[in-house]
Interface confidence: low
Amino acid sequence: NAIQVFDVTAVNISATSLTLIWKVSDNESSSNYTYKIHVAGETDSSNLNVSEPRAVIPGLRSSTFYNITVCPVLGDIEGTPGFLQVHTPPVPVSDFRVTVVSTTEIGLAWSSHDAESFQMHITQEGAGNSRVEITTNQSIIIGGLFPGTKYCFEIVPKGPNGTEGASRTVCNRTVPSAVFDIHVVYVTTTEMWLDWKSPDGASEYVYHLVIESKHGSNHTSTYDKAITLQGLIPGTLYNITISPEVDHVWGDPNSTAQYTRPSNVSNIDVSTNTTAATLSWQNFDDASPTYSYCLLIEKAGNSSNATQVVTDIGITDATVTELIPGSSYTVEIFAQVGDGIKSLEPGRKSFCTDPASMASFDCEVVPKEPALVLKWTCPPGANAGFELEVSSGAWNNATHLESCSSENGTEYRTEVTYLNFSTSYNISITTVSCGKMAAPTRNTCTTGITDPPPPDGSPNITSVSHNSVKVKFSGFEASHGPIKAYAVILTTGEAGHPSADVLKYTYEDFKKGASDTYVTYLIRTEEKGRSQSLSEVLKYEIDVGNESTTLGYYNGKLEPLGSYRACV
């Protein structure tokens, strides 16, 4: 029986060689045989003789179909050959490279002259499973990747009949995603605390920051998704650009712009009138020419109705109008820059507007009293009362009047007492509020008169004739008002103090019997009879019954032996 070759098998197939093994039917004598191997390709063939049931076939073409015959030979006798059909695999790809990288895609390219298709195994660093893509092209874009992540790409060339060439591997990291939601947690004059989000959440990221302002730029980096920037300049615009980086692969930058806060204002100065305040202040920042200022003016006890004023850029003074006279205010001044970035604290100052003067006041005489009634309407705004000063000659007196309210137009009054009758007084009323005094409002007023006080003595009869008498009296004291005239009154009636009614009766009334009392003589003070001596300057002597007429009163003759009493 001729020996037979079977189970011809190719092992260790490469693109250009393979190893054959086979079995023989007579295993014991197999080593006595030689084996004639015929390798027939698509365009060429070759022969090879070996002396054992194994052979390495070199010099093959990649991706080629071969018919292989293994024939046992003993002397001149050939046994039954065994057959094998095999495809050599393609050669490994060359120039396998990364062509483009983004956050979610990596582009790959390679060269191959003999593969029908390519199988790509994509493995994420740290992940067990891999994903497979197949292409017939010599480039591919792998998408759906996670940003900032390392991937390895193993490419296997595929030949005819499912053959696979040796693989090649390249690894690359996707670009980290740009950070987002950059947030300025807080900002002071010289510090800024930033945090941000990274959609990838990779802990090994380094975040590179470029901090730019008109003063220059600075670089820093951090592993955290937050940073505190220090040593900044107040009121300055900073552009902060954050770029993620991992394993020397940089992601797209993202930016935010933020002003540092201005320093607080200082040296606030206030000048006031009744309804306005002019404020000025200082800010010593280099950037202060770019600041505007926000003023909040609040009336004491009324925080719900604050007035806000915003200045133009670079202006460090402002006038606030429509204020209430005599009122206490607090002003807060914030420096602000950019889109309303304010100083951390305002400069504060309390001030009062000037109280309003009283427009005018009226004086009224109190009948028969040495007093004056003052009447006024309350001046606008607030007041803490009024200083009232009353003077006449060297005498003066000051007193405080209670506060008033101008809201309902009420007329206010006060009585000034203990004055002298018929005296001219200079009166001054000054509004007081918040420690300030308004310009005084002045008026000159004269008190009224009352009945003169009784004289010290009665009139004297100095001489008597049959139808006349001489009456001598002293002038009355003028303390209750100036004496304008004296009436000499005669009566034939009962003794008693005559009332003022008798001033209407004349000598004619007496003669007709209408009255037993009448005015016989009226003397004006400026017409008083002069006596020779100075000691008698205020003495008056009247000749009653001399038939003269004074100011319409007839001084008629007396009745001889008539009983008369005289009074002045």
């Epitope: 979610t104 994903r131 998408g143 759906g144 996670f146 940003p147 995603s177 939601d181 947030h183 989000k197 959609p199 990838d200 959440g201 990779a202």
Partner: antibody, heavy 125, light 108 residues
Framework: QVQLVQSGAEVKKPGASVKVSCKAS????????IHWVRQAPGQGLEWMGW????????DYAQKVQGRVTMTTDTSTSTAYMELRSLRSDDTAVYYC??????????????????WGRGTLVTVSS | SSELTQDPAVSVALGQTVRITCQGD??????ASWYQQKPGQAPVLVIY???NRPSGIPDRFSGSSSGNTASLTITGAQAEDEADYYC???????????FGGGTKLTVL
């Protein structure tokens, strides 16, 4: 414009299966994930799972794991959700929703910006 | 925990401000998104991320978060804001998604 159009209402018997479709238009279908969310009558929203339209990867909620299969057909930009062994408590409106990028596991939010109008599935004997 | 907790119902007077809250451990790591759902309609995204509004959502809607709580605030509520509001986020693992139970908002 961007929209997700779902298939019509279905009535099924207990033990049967249902397959709901969701056709995307107005954007690159393979660039995003499709999630499925259901809402039983008078109840709140319940998340069922997602599928990547790019590579077919899926992840399902524990409650429906083993009974649900999510697939995509990129040639027609359509996502499918098949639910097997239906029970009466599967009666619900089933919504598909697009999740906007980013979709990595470490994202800080999960946003469904486009929803289908919903498909009512009634399971009744 | 992979749960988000919301108050079942909240009411607000017309024109007033209302806050709807959402609590859960995952909110320490992930922002919530908020959806408005009116009867018979699909949910509509109103707020996502830190405080982002999709185009077409009125600026009276705003979002905030602190610790394990996210909030949706409607300043000057209108009659058309009456709806169910749901929050969602990734769960603590980051792979799955969770929804809150929903809050029914009534505008009086």
């Amino acid at each position: 414009q961007v929209q997700l159009v779902q298939s019509g209402a279905e009535v099924k018997k207990p033990g049967a299966s249902v397959k709901v479709s969701c056709k995307a238009s107005g954007y690159t279908f393979t660039g995003q994930y499709i999630h499925w969310v259901r809402q039983a009558p008078g109840q709140g929203l319940e998340w069922m799972g997602w599928i990547s339209a790019y590579n077919g990867y899926t992840d399902y909620a524990q409650k429906v794991q083993g009974r649900v299969t999510m697939t995509t057909d990129t040639s027609t930009s359509t996502a499918y959700m098949e639910l097997r062994s239906l029970r009466s408590d599967d009666t619900a409106v089933y919504y598909c929703a697009r999740e906007v990028w980013p979709v990595a596991a470490a994202d800080t939010f999960s946003v469904f910006d486009i929803w289908g109008r919903g498909t009512l599935v009634t399971v009744s004997s | 925990s992979s749960e988000l907790t919301q108050d079942p119902a909240v009411s607000v007077a017309l024109g007033q401000t209302v806050r709807i809250t959402c609590q859960g451990d995952s909110l320490r790591s992930y922002y919530a998104s908020w959806y408005q759902q009116k009867p018979g309609q699909a949910p509509v995204l109103v707020i996502y991320g830190k405080n982002n509004r999709p185009s077409g959502i009125p600026d009276r809607f705003s979002g905030s978060s602190s610790g394990n709580t996210a909030s949706l605030t409607i300043t000057g509520a209108q009659a058309e804001d009456e709806a169910d509001y749901y929050c969602n986020s990734r769960d603590s693992s980051g792979n799955h998604v969770v929804f809150g139970g929903g809050t029914k908002l009534t505008v009086l």
